[in-house]
Amino acid sequence: EQKLISEEDLAGVFELQIHSFGPGPGPGAPRSPCSARGPCRLFFRVCLKPGLSEEAAESPCALGAALSARGPVYTEQPEAPAPDLPLPNGLLQVPFRDAWPGTFSLIIETWREELGDQIGGPAWSLLARVTRRRRLAAGGPWARDIQRAGAWELRFSYRARCELPAVGTACTRLCRPRSAPSRCGPGLRPCAPLEDECEAPPVCRAGCSLEHGFCEQPGECRCLEGWTGPLCTVPASTSSCLGLRGPSSATTGCLVPGPGPCDGNPCANGGSCSETPGSFECTCPRGFYGLRCEVSGVTCADGPCFNGGLCVGGADPDSAYICHCPPGFQGSNCEKRVDRCSLQPCRNGGLCLDLGHALRCRCRAGFAGPRCEHNLDDCAGRACANGGTCVEGGGAHRCSCALGFGGRDCRERADPCAARPCAHGGRCYAHFSGLVCACAPGYMGSRCEFPVHPDGVSALPAAPPGLRPGDPQRHHHHHHHH
């Protein structure tokens, strides 16, 4: 049966690989981050914000954030030539649950942890921050970049990838096995790149009520009659019921909600209240915590970060601190344990084990891989041509083909423009990163779907504000030209 991605499911993961960090070229560059300070080590923080607008530095990382492990300890040798600075191992990964926006701001911070004789333990300071506004389609190759921040130079690569069953450049399409071999269900198309599968309905906004909400476009949440609220979880009051409280009104026959746990907002100090079954939960602003955000005046010296969280900033009671939580914990003070197994990451009936520091999947016989994603029989000895990858499932192999190729074994050249995806006379180009539309004058959008009024405003509210007429809204990747 077709189903929407549930609130807990991941749409995908943004991945960042730091290649090098060190003094930039030219005079005046520092020899090392530890000069005259004793030993130190580096770590990185990545912050993702949606859209391409210049957002205030303190605005939240609405798409997510992640913190690297600490790098190896580095001690400067005064006479020796400056080596490459040792970096933390591994990728920085930022999971996202909603559609990948394609346009985003990427903020990478390099932090120094000084390990000298600090009163109260190590000291942290921000060495460099780079901010790049980028277009990036999910599912493409690694994009490479080099950025300078003051006297420092950072080299890195990044990509966004979807977590199956989500696919597409925004991770908004779902693939499900076909109900019949020859066709998909009503209104559903074959699901590129997995042509053997069918597209599921669009992915609604995270948290949209499965009983009372629905969506026609990814990321929206439209309510059935009688329900309201951003997630369609609030019973709607009809005009004749206004002013009444209690479970129902015999005179009007309409249902009205009783007192809710968030009525009157029990969260202090600007905290926001969200209802939970039979109770409520406060999300506290920086500098406050507690059940009702009632605890304040906290600094990092008070140790507000639980479960091994890293406290940054907040040197005095007037400045806010931030807790960077280790994997498996969340909340403004890392007080909430994430039940990562609720995301059902183990495929093919594998058993999920949350070990705290890591997730493990115990696979059923015949399956293997970190998430039990490999069917040991399906892809053995099968080759997908032209850079395609073998995808297992249902006892039969199929190929997920690289851009520009199709067919069972990816041997057929596919033209991404063959379906004429650019509306209103727009031109489609078979760019290496995916199709690109150049719109005819008077139209805009990634598929030229929005007419532009003479005042430069799109006729549809779905068009992002500030978009120029004819803006392709497309995303690219650094890659070789074919």
């Epitope: 520009g404 050249r413 033209d415 991404p416 423009c417 031109r427 489609c428 180009y429 078979a430 760019h431 290496f432 990163s433 199709l435 690109v436 150049a438 719109c439 005819a440 004058p441 120029r468 007429p469 004819g470 803006d471 392709p472 809204q473 497309r474 690219h476 030209h481 074919h482």
Partner: antibody
Framework: QVTLRESGPALVKPTQTLTLTCTFS?????????MGWVRQAPGQGLEWMGT????????DYASWAKGRVTISVDTSKNQFSLKLSSVTAADTAVYYC???????????WGQGTLVTVSS | DIQLTQSPSFLSASVGDRVTITCQST????????LSWYQQKPGQPPKLLIY???NLEIGVPSRFSGSGSGTDFTLTINSLEAEDAATYYC??????????FGGGTKVEIK
């Protein structure tokens, strides 16, 4: 190997029509591109002449070239061609064919062919 | 007609210098960033350096960078090297499927 190669006469007389051919290999016009012609007079800058869009074979020309330039495609021979009518000495230039695959840039160029207009 | 104006038309600089070339268009380029930069050496076709205003083409040294949007764009060579002696062109793509090149900037090594 994806390549473009221009060919045609090195010398043309004034008032005649210049015909140049661009032969491509390593890709097919079944995908959608702009195939364009760009010229460069000796010691001068680059000048866009026109393009043909392989999605529907529509053509676009620089304003100065309209009425003088015709670009067409022969898919069976993997070629596209440029016709420039009523040439004068001012049309003496290196002529390049180039391919655009999106985002407005020519990512693939031929080596160019020098055409001299002289009687 | 759309005009792309490059300045300066000629510059002489020393190895290690930071060089900046500007490109101004009489109309906004398509999507506000469909502008590219090329390097051309005598007897060779142009070589793509930067596309979409700021994206470095694969294989191009990182000392080259591009910025700008709409009508005003900049190419920067951070630390000039001898092999960078060449002529540099900007090129825009415009609504209505037209292209235009700048007049070029010749960079000479002192």
């Amino acid at each position: 190997q994806v390549t473009l190669r221009e060919s045609g006469p090195a010398l043309v007389k004034p008032t005649q029509t210049l015909t140049l051919t661009c032969t491509f290999s390593g890709f097919s016009l079944s995908s959608s591109y702009d195939m364009g012609w760009v010229r460069q007079a000796p010691g001068q800058g680059l000048e866009w002449m026109g393009t043909i869009y392989t999605g529907d074979y529509s053509t676009d020309y620089a304003s100065w070239a309209k009425g003088r330039v015709t670009i067409s495609v022969d898919t069976s021979k993997n070629q596209f061609s440029l016709k420039l009518s009523s040439v004068t000495a001012a049309d003496t230039a290196v002529y390049y064919c180039a391919r655009h695959t999106g985002y407005g840039y020519f990512g693939l160029w031929g080596q160019g062919t020098l055409v001299t207009v002289s009687s | 007609d759309i005009q792309l104006t490059q300045s300066p038309s000629f510059l002489s600089a020393s190895v290690g210098d930071r060089v900046t070339i500007t490109c101004q268009s009489t109309e906004s380029v398509y999507g506000s960033d469909w502008l590219s930069w090329y390097q051309q050496k005598p007897g060779q076709p142009p070589k793509l350096l930067i596309y979409q205003a700021s994206n470095l083409e694969i294989g191009v040294p990182s000392r080259f960078s591009g910025s700008g949007s709409g009508t005003d764009f900049t190419l920067t060579i951070n630390s000039l090297e001898a092999e960078d002696a060449a002529t540099y062109y900007c090129q825009g793509y415009y609504s209505g499927y037209s292209y235009a090149f700048g007049g070029g900037t010749k960079v000479e090594i002192k």
